[in-house]
């Protein structure tokens, strides 16, 4: 069976974690309201029932207060993400209390028993939410619970258990192990706050699922399709993190959560939007870049609430790195005739020339196969802002890069040797961009000339309707 | 201002047990970790683990594991580090060094440490 | 664990004049933009001290004659001008993950 690898490392390490001899060891949770953007600061300890520190340490009762809920850990201390999340929440909010919950002792376990003590510390936030409702201006609408892995789930619990709604809890890669398929009462789920939004980065369809694939949300983002984010390979990591190990690919995709979060939070003039789309394959191919009717949304900190009938899936693609956004096309080829094809889906990439900048090179993914007389649907982004979309370059590869497609062309070959060259037809492309929402069709430059084959290029430029807008809102226009 | 006190040198014959205090005073005991860290003579520094002095809960690094236990008397905001079965070896300083349990947990205030010799 | 190699592992300097002391790292101790890369001055028989923190802080009460820089896994400490007190040894620590580990020291003495 697949090794059950965590956040920090392999569950089984802990069978052979120390107790804490002669020691005696306080089953608690601590709340320690970060003062300070300076991390080294001891910050202050709320406890209920005790109003001092409030006072003393500026408890604002009518901001906007924040929750930080770290997850399973085995080394006992807090992990690097949970500063810079803290000092993204004070750079964006200023006059925010934020406040980290502290279950170190109770998360510094077997994960199965850190699991088990999710309940209890999900007691304690809403106890703590409890007493400071009793206080004059404060408002459970004001509460944001932001969860990370297993700390999503506690979130919930702690969402379930108060007195009242609170306002929004944000899951960041809510844990898989043990809450996969749990019931809504055991995990976190929709009816835990007025607004509850998760993002996926790590869930895997094969093996152990380190995040929770179900939807648990309002609206549950899938980046990248939920499971490999670019950056995180073993290749990428060997280079540029602590260590080139398989727990740290692991960490790089789990942690991707809160970094988009805090992306969210310092970037707020580079916004990622996320789709709607039933799947991943169905968003791979391009067909779930609308805006329309609540379709698309901010994602992290600036996601506009949206409480659906259902869970939301949505989904997008972005950097390796910060600030994450891309921008997302779809492309439409209608495909009016090809020959001799052949057993082999041929390789196509596109080029764009915008007014701001021109894209790279970028492969068109054939999710399927290319149907004939068909229109074929494709996704392709990119990196920059390329501005008013002026033509386009398609290229259909030459020589064949894989061993497989070289196999499958002699295969031809031995069964049709005087096989006539392969081509095919298009006379248009429609793009429609997810970020502006505008559509476009581009038409081939010489209407006489619409064929391409293996080698060759085909060019297509702006035909002379212009830009076509639907009555479909720009993801843009709807920032909060 | 804030400080950490170790107890005095201590000269032990081999097979003998020790215990070493470190007292805090200036600043909230509990809302700092406290690390353990031994100098051999001639030699740089090792970490031995910490203990989290809030929760109890110690943590010992790989060379550590079996003759050493941390403890706390928070009451008295002292952490404790008793060595069993002493070798030869194990003379050396011992340092406590106190980390936050936030930021980049670098050890901040050290106590001026504590000489224990081991010889028969 | 993290390896710290320092170099060189003594140094002799006139007063006056600068002394560098650099610590590489087995693999990179930063985290995003943070460097969790540490300093520490130990003179004979006394604990060691925190000089810098987070690769190019300076502690509280340490002279600006100290000076840190470097990120990923090549840090340096920079001690200019050199000092007559300044006779120490010198270690690096990275505390990006448990176990915090130090490097093997540098000896400084003044000629």
């Known amino acids: 069976s697949p090794v059950p690898f965590g956040p920090e490392g392999r569950l089984e390490d802990k069978l052979h974690k120390p107790k804490a001899t002669q020691t005696e060891v306080k089953p608690s949770v601590r709340f320690n309201l970060r003062t300070s953007k300076d991390p080294e600061h001891e910050g202050c300890y709320l406890s209920v029932g005790h109003s001092q520190p409030l006072e003393d340490c500026s408890f604002n009762m009518t901001a906007k207060t924040f929750f930080i809920i770290h997850g399973w850990t085995m080394s006992g201390i807090f992990e690097n993400w949970l500063h810079k999340l803290v000092s993204a929440l004070h750079t964006r909010e200023k006059d925010a209390n934020v406040v980290v919950v502290d279950w170190l002792p109770l998360a510094h376990q077997l994960y199965t028993d850190a699991v088990n003590n999710t309940r209890v510390v999900g007691h304690s936030i809403a106890r703590m939410l409890d007493w400071l409702q009793e206080k004059d201006d404060f408002s459970l609408g004001n509460v944001h619970l932001i969860g990370y892995s297993l700390g999503a789930h506690v979130a919930g619990y702690a969402g379930n258990f108060v007195k009242g709604t609170v306002g929004r809890i944000t899951g960041l890669d809510p844990a898989g192990p043990m809450f996969e398929g749990a019931d809504i009462h055991k995990r976190l789920s929709p009816d835990d706050a007025d607004f509850v939004d998760v993002l996926h980065t790590y869930t895997r369809s094969f093996g152990l699922s380190i995040g929770i694939q179900m939807p648990v949300g309002h609206i549950d983002i899938y980046p990248n399709g939920g499971d490999f984010q670019p950056g995180c390979g073993l290749n990428d990591v060997l280079g540029s993190i602590a260590y080139g190990t398989i727990t740290e690919v692991v960490k790089c995709e789990h942690e991707r959560a809160v970094h988009l979060f805090v992306d969210s939070l310092v970037n707020q003039d580079k916004p990622s939007f996320a789709f709607q789309c039933t799947d991943s394959n169905r968003f791979k191919k391009g067909i779930c870049l609308s805006c329309r009717k609540n379709r698309c949304n901010s994602i992290g900190y600036n996601a506009k609430k949206m409480r659906n009938k259902r869970n939301s899936k949505m989904y997008l693609k972005t950097r390796a790195g910060m600030p994450f956004r891309v921008y997302h096309y779809q492309m439409k080829i209608h495909v009016f005739s090809y020959k001799n094809m052949g057993e082999i889906e041929p390789t196509f990439y596109v080029t764009l020339y915008g007014t701001n900048a021109d894209s790279q090179t970028l492969p068109l993914e054939i999710v399927e196969r290319i149907e004939q007389n068909a229109t074929n649907t494709f996704l392709v982004y990119t990196e920059e802002d390329l501005g008013d979309l002026l033509k386009i370059q398609l290229t259909w590869e030459g020589a064949s890069q894989s061993w497989y497609n070289l196999w499958k062309e002699f295969r031809s070959y031995l069964s049709q040797p005087r096989n006539p060259g392969r081509e095919l037809n298009i006379r248009r492309i429609r793009v429609k961009s997810g970020e502006t929402q505008r559509k476009l069709t581009f038409c081939t430059e010489d209407p006489e000339n619409t064929s391409i084959s293996p080698g060759r290029e085909l060019w297509f430029r702006k035909c002379r309707d212009g830009w076509r807008m639907k009555n479909e809102t720009s993801p843009t226009v709807e920032l909060p | 201002q804030v400080q950490l006190v170790q107890s005095g040198s201590e000269l032990k014959k081999p097979g003998a047990s020790v215990k070493v205090s470190c007292k805090a005073s200036?600043?909230?005991?509990?809302?700092?970790?406290l690390n353990w860290v031994r100098q051999a003579p001639g030699q740089g520094l090792e970490w031995m683990g910490w203990?989290?002095?809030?929760?109890?809960?110690?943590t010992y690094a790989g060379d550590f594991k079996g003759r050493f236990v941390f403890s706390l008397d928070t009451s008295v905001s002292t952490a404790y580090l008793q060595i069993s079965s002493l070798k030869a070896e194990d003379t050396a300083v011992y340092y406590c060094?106190?980390?936050?349990?936030?930021?980049?947990?670098?050890?901040?205030?050290w106590g001026k440490g504590t000489t224990v010799t081991v010889s028969s | 664990d993290i390896v710290l190699t320092q170099s060189p592992a003594s140094l002799a300097v006139s007063p006056g004049q600068r002394a560098t002391i650099t610590c590489k790292a087995s693999?990179?101790?930063?985290?995003?933009?943070?460097?969790?890369m540490h300093w520490y001055q130990q003179k004979p028989g006394q604990p060691p001290k925190l000089l810098i923190y987070?690769?190019?802080n300076l502690a509280s009460g340490v002279p600006a004659r100290f000076s840190g820089s470097g990120s990923g896994t090549d840090f340096t400490l920079t001690i200019n001008p050199v000092e007559a007190n300044d006779t120490a040894n010198y270690y690096c620590?990275?505390?990006?993950?448990?176990?915090?580990?130090f490097g093997g020291g540098t000896k400084v003495e003044i000629k």
């Open positions: 060094a106190r980390r936050g349990y936030y930021g980049r947990r670098f050890f901040d205030v």
């Open positions: 200036g600043y909230t005991f509990t809302n700092y970790g």
């Open positions: 203990i989290n002095t809030y929760s109890g809960v110690p």
């Open positions: 693999q990179s101790v930063d985290y995003d933009v943070d460097s969790y």
């Open positions: 987070a690769a190019s």
């Open positions: 620590q990275q505390t990006i993950e448990d176990p915090p580990t």
